[in-house]
């Protein structure tokens, strides 16, 4: 591997060790639980394609008002702290991807079923954009083996 790649990996590792990604995890868990409560069910029921254009975070206008703006104070506080942490990764997209992977891995045991996992993954992919940052475009968030088509 090229020297700069190895240096980048080491820099990312230390960045990840310094980062506190817990607010991001809390914010996302509150978000998907609140969505389920407000709909009275999983909003991404099997009858809907979770990768349909209207639900694909890559298709959402990143400059439309944040869907989190109207949320409770606790969540917005978590979001603000989360965004501050993610901001540290802005100039290293690959490392931001690793941060998102870490969030996914940390929460995977708490996600109930495939649908909730997919919803969490969608919200997680969209999280950097909600913070006004570019989302990593080539990022695996699979906890288990096997991929999903993205776009």
């Amino acid at each position: 591997r090229q020297q700069w790649e190895l240096q980048g990996d080491r820099r990312c590792q230390s960045q990840l060790e310094r980062a506190n990604l817990r607010p991001c995890e809390q914010h996302l868990m509150q978000k998907i639980q609140r969505d389920e409560d407000s709909y009275g069910r999983d909003p991404y029921s099997p009858s809907q394609d979770p990768y349909s254009p209207s639900q694909d975070p890559d298709r959402r206008d990143p400059y439309s008002p944040s869907p989190y703006d109207r949320r409770g104070a606790g969540s917005s506080q978590h979001q603000e702290r989360c965004c501050n942490e993610l901001n540290e990764f802005e100039n290293n997209q690959r490392c931001m991807c690793e941060a998102l992977q870490q969030i996914m891995e940390n929460q995977s045991d708490r996600l109930q079923g495939r649908q909730q996992e997919q919803q969490f993954k969608r919200e997680l992919r969209n999280l950097p954009q909600q913070c006004g940052l570019r989302a990593p475009q080539r990022c695996d968030l699979e906890v288990e083996s096997g991929g999903r088509d993205r776009y």
Epitope: Q2, E5, Y63, Q93, A135, Q137, R138, C139, E142
Partner: antibody
């Protein structure tokens, strides 16, 4: 020296299939996302499909979704594009392209291209 | 999808001329804007990435600038080998999209 060598292009009838391959060398293939980009005289350059370095997550342009499948074999440094239900509009030169390590959204090396012609 | 619009679509210039090509994105893309050069019968070749960073091996007469939605590629003093087609590309969001190209030919 980075090298990408495409193969598998040719003449095929509408509705037919082709499988393109791209042999990579000169870099750590398993560290990089890879893409297929095509070029037609009318449409210019169009990104077609990509996948992450592990191959777990795939991405497609709307125009090929459901018809094309991208895959890779990291043990052999190979990238593939399986093209089914081909249409006249798929006629193009297909390039295999290496994406930058840091996921900044550019193609730092390209193959020489393989020509695909869909015609009856 | 993010639309990329290049101008002009073609231009005629002489060796030694200063040439500027512009590229506009349909929405803000920060500095995720990249430039390629393509010669007849060849694959595109990366010139500039992240709006202004020169790819290794590319002559310093090429430069790029801009951020947000408006970008430009400048060749400070055109050389015979620079006559080609130039493309911009956004890498901010899937699907990555290209401009329609600017053909630079000999006056």
């Amino acid at each position: 020296e980075v090298q990408l060598l495409e193969s598998g292009g040719g003449l095929v009838q509408p509705g037919g299939s082709l499988r393109l391959s791209c042999a990579a060398s000169g870099f750590t293939f398993s560290n990089h996302a890879m893409s297929w980009v095509r070029q037609t005289p009318g449409e210019g350059l169009q990104w077609v499909s990509a996948l992450t370095y592990s191959g777990k997550t795939t991405y497609y342009a709307d125009s090929v979704k459901g018809r094309f499948t991208i895959s890779r074999d990291n043990s052999k440094n190979l990238l593939f594009l399986q093209m089914n239900s081909l249409r006249a509009g798929d006629t193009a030169i297909y390039y295999c392209a290496k994406e930058d390590y840091d996921d900044r959204g550019f193609f730092d090396f390209w193959g020489q291209g393989t020509r695909v012609t869909v015609s009856s | 999808d993010i639309q990329m619009t290049q101008s002009p679509s073609s231009l005629s210039a002489s060796v030694g001329d200063r040439v500027t090509i512009t590229c506009r994105a349909s929405q803000t893309i920060s500095t995720y804007l990249h430039w390629y050069q393509q010669k007849p019968g060849k694959a595109p070749n990366l010139l500039i990435y992240a709006a202004s960073t020169l790819q290794s091996g590319v002559p310093s007469r090429f430069s790029g600038s801009g951020s947000g939605t408006d970008f430009s590629l400048t060749i400070s003093s055109l050389r015979p080998e620079d006559f080609a087609i130039y493309y911009c590309q956004q890498g901010y969001n899937n699907p990555y999209t290209f401009g329609q190209g600017t053909k630079v030919d000999i006056k």
